[in-house]
Interface confidence: low
C-alpha cells in the first residue's frame, strides 16, 4: 500500500539477481515490540527504544593537521547493554574500551532520558509526516550533491556495529541544502524491521515503510561532530524510505551482497566505492524538511532532517536480506532497529512542493493549515 505523495516515481533498479538467500526471521520476544513510556499513545508495530548506530555512531572529523590533505573519520564510541543469551534482544554494543556513555537498549531500562537528558527534549526525531499539514516552502530548492559518485578505490568500510550496518564515507562528499547551508557526508546506515514487519523510522500519516536509509552530514561550519552536536543545523541527515518493487536494485546490491560477511556483530569488511547518490531517490527537488534530533542517545537536537518524497525500490529478496542477515550482540537478531515517532510539539514540517495538494479525484479540497513563514519558528 502506498500513501499519497510518497510513491516511487522512478524506481532505482536493474542489475542481476543475487544468489544468496539470507537467514530467515527469528521469533523475537514480545518485549521488542512493545511501546515505551515516551511513545505516543495508540502507536502500534513499534519495537522498543532504538539501538542502532545510526546518527549517534557518528564518525569524528579530525583537523587536517592530523592527516595531511584529508579528513580523518573515526567512530565515536557507542555503548553496550547486557543481554540474556537465552532471550534474543537487540542491544547496543561497545566498539571500544573506555566508553563513558551509559548503557541503553531497546525497550528496557534505563529510560533514554536517564542515559541522555536530551532524549526527553521537545524536538525529537523521528516524526510522523502528514503531507496535508506540511508547509509548502518554495524557497526549498533542489538538493545539491557533489562528489557522491565514488570510484571503486579506495574501498569503504562496511560495518555491523551491533545495531545497524554502517558505511563510512570518505572525505569529499559535499551536500548543500541551499545557499550557505553546506555539509559533508560522513556515513550512511539503514533502519529496518523484520519479516512482514516494516522498520522505517519516519512514518507518513502513520504508515511505516519497510526500511529507511540515513546519510549523515556535518556542517562545514564545524570541524568535528562533537562540536556540532546540539547546534542548530550542525548536523543534517538525508532520509529516504525503502519499499518493495519488482526489480533488484543494483546500487543496493553492492552493499546487501556483502552483508553475510559481516553477519557477526562487530565485524566489518571493505567494499568498493560506489555511487552513493544511487542509493537515494532520483528526485532531489521534492522533500520534507524539519528540525529534529539524533534518533538514538545522545538524541542531540538541532539536526536538519530532509526526507525525500520519492521512495527507493528494492526487491523483496533484497529487503529480506537486509532484515534477516545481521546479528546483534549475544543471541539477538539485528532487527526492528527503529525508534518510535516523537511528537512534533508545535514544529511545522516544511515541504519543497505543494504536498497538501492531492491529485487524487477522490480527495477533498485540502486545507493548507501551515505556511512556509510559520515553519521557521
Amino acid at each position: 500500500q502506498r500513501l499519497p505523495r510518497m510513491q516511487e516515481d522512478s524506481p532505482l533498479g536493474g542489475g542481476s539477481s543475487g544468489e544468496d538467500d539470507p537467514l530467515g526471521e527469528e521469533d523475537l520476544p514480545s518485549e521488542e515490540d512493545s511501546p515505551r513510556e515516551e511513545d505516543p499513545p495508540g502507536e502500534e508495530d513499534l519495537p522498543g527504544e532504538e539501538d542502532l548506530p545510526g546518527e549517534e555512531d557518528l564518525p569524528e572529523v579530525k583537523p587536517k593537521s592530523e592527516e595531511e590533505g584529508s579528513l580523518k573519520l573515526e567512530d565515536l564510541p557507542t555503548v553496550e547493554a547486557p543481554g540474556d543469551p537465552q532471550e534474543p534482544q537487540n542491544n547496543a554494543h561497545r566498539d571500544k574500551e573506555g566508553d563513558d556513555q551509559s548503557h541503553w537498549r531497546y525497550g528496557g531500562d534505563p529510560p533514554w532520558p536517564r542515559v541522555s537528558p536530551a532524549c526527553a527534549g521537545r524536538f525529537q526525531s523521528p516524526v510522523d509526516i502528514r503531507p496535508q499539514l506540511a508547509a509548502f516552502c518554495p524557497a526549498l530548492r533542489p538538493l545539491e550533491l557533489l562528489g557522491f559518485q565514488l570510484p571503486p578505490l579506495p574501498e569503504l568500510r562496511l560495518r555491523n556495529n551491533g545495531h545497524s550496518v554502517q558505511l563510512t564515507l570518505p572525505p569529499g562528499l559535499e551536500m548543500a541544502l541551499g545557499p550557505g547551508r553546506e555539509y559533508r557526508a560522513l556515513q550512511l546506515h539503514l533502519h529496518w524491521g523484520a519479516a512482514g514487519r516494516p522498520g522505517s523510522e519516519h512514518t507518513v500519516e502513520g504508515h511505516r515503510f519497510p526500511a529507511e536509509i540515513h546519510v549523515v552530514h556535518l556542517s562545514t561550519a564545524f570541524a568535528r561532530v562533537d562540536e556540532a552536536l546540539g547546534r542548530p543545523g550542525g548536523l543534517a541527515v538525508l532520509a529516504a524510505f525503502l519499499e518493495e518493487g519488482p526489480e533488484e536494485n543494483s546500487a543496493y546490491e553492492q552493499l546487501l551482497s556483502r552483508l553475510e560477511e559481516i553477519a557477526e556483530e562487530g565485524s566489518e569488511t571493505q567494499v568498493p566505492g560506489l555511487d552513493i547518490s544511487a542509493l537515494l531517490p532520483s528526485d532531489f527537488s521534492r522533500y520534507f524538511q524539519y528540525e529534529g534530533s539524533l534518533t538514538t542517545p545522545p538524541c542531540a537536537q538541532g539536526v536538519i532532517w530532509t526526507v525525500f518524497n520519492q521512495t527507493v525500490m528494492l526487491s523483496a529478496k533484497q529487503l529480506h536480506t537486509l532484515s534477516d542477515t545481521l546479528w546483534g550482540p549475544g543471541d539477538s537478531r539485528l532487527q526492528l532497529n527503529f525508534r518510535a515517532t516523537q511528537p512534533l510539539n508545535g514544529r511545522v514540517i516544511e515541504a519543497s512542493f505543494p504536498a497538501g495538494v492531492d491529485s487524487s479525484p477522490r480527495a477533498a479540497e485540502p486545507v493548507q493549515l501551515n505556511s512556509c513563514l510559520a515553519a521557521g519558528d
Epitope: G24, D27, E261, E264
Partner: antibody, heavy 119, light 107 residues
Amino acid sequence: QVQLVESGGGLVQPGGSLRLSCAASGFTFSSYSMSWVRQAPGKGLEWVSYISSSGSTIYYADSVKGRFTISRDNAKNSLYLQMNSLGAEDTAVYYCARHRSYRFALDYWGQGTTVTVSS
Amino acid sequence: EIVMTQSPATLSVSPGERATLSCRASQSVSRGLAWYQQKPGQAPRLLIYSASTRATDIPAKFSGSGSGTEFTLTISSLQSEDVAVYYCQQYNKWPLTFGGGTKVDIK
C-alpha cells in the same frame, strides 16, 4: 583451497583429558567462525561447540558444557578443543568445520579425528 | 532446543528417479536450514543453505525448499554417486541441531 586438518585424537581412559587441534589453511582464518561437530560410531552428527571469528562469542552443547573448552589462535590459524572429564559417551569422530559466516551453515569440514574413551 | 526430525530413515530409489527427503523442525527456524551429504568414511559436505540456496559446486539436481518447520531436499535424478546419508541442520537458534539423517540407496 580450503583445508581443515584435525589432530590430537586417540584412546583415553574415562575421566581423562585430550586436546584436539584443527589447522586451517587456504582462507583467512580470522574472518570465519568455527565449530566442532562430533559423530559417535554409527550415529548422526552432533554439534559440540562454536567460536566466533574473534573468539568473543562461544557456545557449547549442554552435553559438554563445563567439561570442554573451545579456543582459537588466529595468529596460528588454529582451532582447539580441550576435553576434560571424558566419558564413554564422548567416543566419536570429531570434526572441525567452518561457518560460511557468523552462525551460518558449515561449508567446509575436516576429515575428523577419532576419540575413543575406554578403560 | 529445536529438535529436527528427518523422514524416512531409509529411502531406496531406482536410478534416474526422484528422491524426496523431509525434515521437520519442532519450532520455526524460518529459512535457517542446511542440508549435508555424508558418504561412508567421509566428512559431511554442504549441499544447501538458507533452505534453498545451493552451495558452491553443488549440481542443480539437488534442490531445497520449505521454510518455518517443514523442509524438503529433492534429488531430481538419483545416481549411484548420490548414495549417502543426508542430514538437515538448523542454525536459527542455539544450540545448532541436526536431524537424525536419511540413508539414501539405490533400489
